[in-house]
């Protein structure tokens, strides 16, 4: 339905608090580096615009469409040559192509300082002395940091942030209260914003058709009782909420969502049994829950899948009237039957079918060509299980920090060219999949393994194409969606890479070791090690957990010594020293 | 399993020198650091030298520096302690340990295999 004033119609969908929040997260995930005074400035800006066209939709440039009302917005912004380089070309550009400009320039590693966490005391006061600016500061500080956030989902993230404060700084213990409550919202936070990242990623880089087979796969693990017309109904509605978010397209993006929650509910009867609770919440909570959502007992008896796409004679005319119609039903009906299989298996085994149909229907006897197909899933299917199985061993062995240093080894053997912040990250969050997903059983293993894994890698593909130093990386992250994990898996030690030489600077540590939390304190070992494999990708893991163990030896001793300085300097010279004479850097 | 047996222990006089040493058979000695320990009567087991897994890097008590050397011989699977200037303080059983995966190189929650010790008595 054609509005005279998109604008309008926004703001009035939305609301002004919304429509205010979204444009200060629209405008501070395209400006990453601006003030957030500026942005406010802005937000003011276009926020009385908009009332002027809820008063008179025929109003001067009410009919413009929204990339052009915040388009022409950000481009009076006065320092963007300055701050932004080249990105102040885009304001050149018309629409639509200027917005595809600025959505090109949004940085997934933008050089901001790390946010510190002020006392508690300070933290309250502030909220008390300007609740709207405090949690205007939360969005416009994410928002900037992570590009890709969801920002519907970032508006239920600030209402949760704004209860923790409303809470906990009544209480008696205002920390023991409040600090746990932000570590959740923080570690959540990055959860949520890599996974938006990955959904990013497909339709931007692989299109709507790879969005679209996702959303198949997955929904019908959710939903295993909705009928194929109603999951493909959803799957249509939930790629162009997604499609609108990761276009920049915010406040459509949010009022799509609604839309969305607002339909499921209207027909949980029809979608699954398991959406009661989260139908009787608030609007942004409700979004959140459904998507969050339990899978759905799987429907009594369901048929032998060899029936339909297998034994009929009718496969290949079925596949040539329709053939992604066809690929979705086989998708549809193989997920909503393996809750237990990640999602990006379910994608490889129907490309597997997808390519089996494309030869054989051609053949002479196509039938005869496309019996066994079944038969072809089987070691895609135990490739991932094996694999999971050897590293929650390797895990429950390990602990959670040795884990991800045997995995920092791996990596910077197979990808040393990349950066040594970039493998600690991701390897760091590599080996966070054993803690989420060890602990269940077998039935949920794989989906919580290999799915989680999927975005992790996606992180990694991002950060590394912002700078590409490694064409392995490149081909792993190019060349298919679905097969990203396995190419990784599958790359052994690089024997073409030169050893980095030896710089003593990246050994040397002092004594602000000592104040560092634990995480950060692993952090910089981890960056040690990093920077040991580069540097001898030959050593062995005994020899590097040697290292590492003087490495920890020294560390302890010197944060233990009266003059902690003068320890760190002698007894580093010695340690570079004695790990140089024993691994020959 | 790792076995380890030290030996060089006895009785000497203030002043004197003694040489400990502890030979390890089982998993590869060459990939642990090691460490000696010491426990008087009464008093709990206390760190006296952590040698490193290639022999380049030695940590001491603060007693003992200066007067105790720890060194290994990777080939012969044995790691040393030469003792000088022992005083009175100094009696104790002494213990050997090889490193574990974990926890501190100064407490011997961090040492995984230990051992029987061997008695040094410093009189005066």
């Known amino acids: 339905d054609a509005h005279k004033s998109e604008v309008a119609h926004r703001f009035k969908d939305l609301g002004e608090e919304n429509f205010k929040a979204l444009v200060l997260i629209a405008f501070a995930q395209y400006l990453q580096q601006c003030p957030f005074e500026d942005h406010v400035k802005l937000v003011n800006e276009v926020t009385e615009f908009a009332k002027t066209c809820v008063a008179d939709e025929s109003a001067e440039n009410c009919d413009k469409s929204l990339h052009t009302l915040f388009g022409d917005k950000l481009c009076t912004v006065a320092t963007l040559r300055e701050t932004y380089g080249e990105m102040a070309d885009c304001c050149a550009k018309q629409e639509p192509e200027r917005n595809e400009c600025f959505l090109q320039h949004k940085d997934d590693n933008p050089n901001l300082p790390r946010l510190v966490r002020p006392e508690v005391d300070v933290m309250c006061t502030a909220f008390h002395d300007n609740e709207e600016t405090f949690l205007k500061k939360y969005l416009y500080e994410i928002a900037r940091r992570h590009p890709y956030f969801y920002a519907p989902e970032l508006l239920f993230f600030a209402k949760r942030y704004k209860a923790a404060f409303t809470e906990c700084c009544q209480a008696a213990d205002k920390a023991a209260c409040l600090l746990p409550k932000l570590d959740e919202l923080r570690d959540e936070g990055k959860a949520s914003s890599a996974k938006q990242r990955l959904k990013c990623a497909s339709l931007q880089k692989f299109g709507e058709r790879a969005f679209k087979a996702w959303a198949v796969a997955r929904l019908s693990q959710r939903f295993p009782k909705a009928e194929f017309a109603e999951v493909s109904k959803l799957v249509t509605d939930l790629t162009k909420v997604h499609t609108e978010c990761c276009h920049g397209d915010l406040l459509e993006c949010a009022d799509d969502r609604a839309d969305l929650a607002k339909y499921i509910c209207e027909n949980q009867d029809s979608i699954s049994s398991k959406l009661k609770e989260c139908c009787e919440k608030p609007l942004l909570e409700k979004s959140h829950c459904i998507a969050e959502v339990e899978n759905d007992e799987m429907p009594a008896d369901l048929p032998s899948l060899a029936a339909d796409f297998v034994e009929s004679k009718d496969v290949c005319k079925n596949y040539a009237e329709a053939k992604d119609v066809f690929l979705g039903m086989f998708l549809y009906e193989y997920a909503r039957r393996h809750p237990d299989y990640s999602v990006v298996l379910l994608l490889r085994l129907a490309k597997t079918y997808e390519t089996t149909l494309e030869k054989c229907c051609a053949a002479a006897d196509p039938h005869e060509c496309y019996a066994k197909v079944f038969d072809e899933f089987k070691p895609l299917v135990e490739e991932p299980q094996n694999l999971i199985k050897q590293n929650c061993e390797l895990f429950e062995q390990l602990g959670e920090y040795k884990f991800q240093n045997a995995l920092l080894v791996r990596y910077t053997k197979k990808v040393p060219q990349v950066s040594t912040p970039t493998l600690v990250e991701v390897s760091r969050n590599l080996g966070k999949v054993g803690s989420k997903c060890c602990k269940h059983p077998e039935a949920k293993r794989m989906p919580c393994a290999e799915d989680y894994l999927s975005v992790v890698l996606n992180q990694l593909c991002v950060l590394h194409e912002k700078t590409p130093v490694s064409d392995r990386v490149t081909k792993c992250c190019t060349e298919s969606l679905v097969n990203r994990r396995p190419c990784f898996s599958a790359l052994e030690v690089d024997e073409t890479y030169v050893p980095k030489e030896f710089n003593a600077e990246t050994f040397t540590f002092h004594a602000d070791i000592c104040t560092l939390s634990e995480k950060e304190r692993q952090i910089k070992k981890q960056t040690a090690l990093v920077e040991l494999v580069k540097h001898k990708p030959k050593a062995t893991k005994e020899q590097l957990k040697a290292v590492m163990d003087d490495f920890a030896a020294f560390v302890e001793k010197c944060c233990k010594a009266d003059d902690k300085e003068t320890c760190f300097a002698e007894e580093g010279k010695k340690l570079v020293a004695a790990s140089q004479a024993a691994l020959g850097l | 399993q790792v076995q380890l047996v030290e030996s060089g222990g006895g009785l000497v006089q203030a002043g004197d020198s003694l040489r400990l040493s502890c030979a390890a058979s089982?998993?590869?000695?060459?990939?642990?650091?090691m460490g000696w320990f010491r426990q008087a009567p009464g008093k709990e087991r206390e760190f006296v030298a952590r040698?490193?897994?290639?022999?380049?890097?030695?940590y001491y008590a603060d007693s003992v520096k200066g007067r105790f050397t720890a060194s290994r011989d990777n080939a012969k699977n044995t790691v040393y302690l030469q003792m000088n200037s022992l005083k009175p303080e100094d009696t104790a059983v002494y213990y050997c340990?090889?490193?574990?995966?974990?926890?501190?190189?100064?407490?011997?929650?961090?040492?995984?295999?230990w051992g029987q010790g061997t008695q040094v008595t410093v009189s005066s």
């Open positions: 340990a090889q490193r574990g995966d974990s926890g501190s190189n100064y407490d011997p929650s961090g040492y995984r295999y």
């Open positions: 040698i490193n897994w290639s022999g380049t890097l030695t």
């Open positions: 089982g998993r590869t000695f060459s990939d642990y650091a």
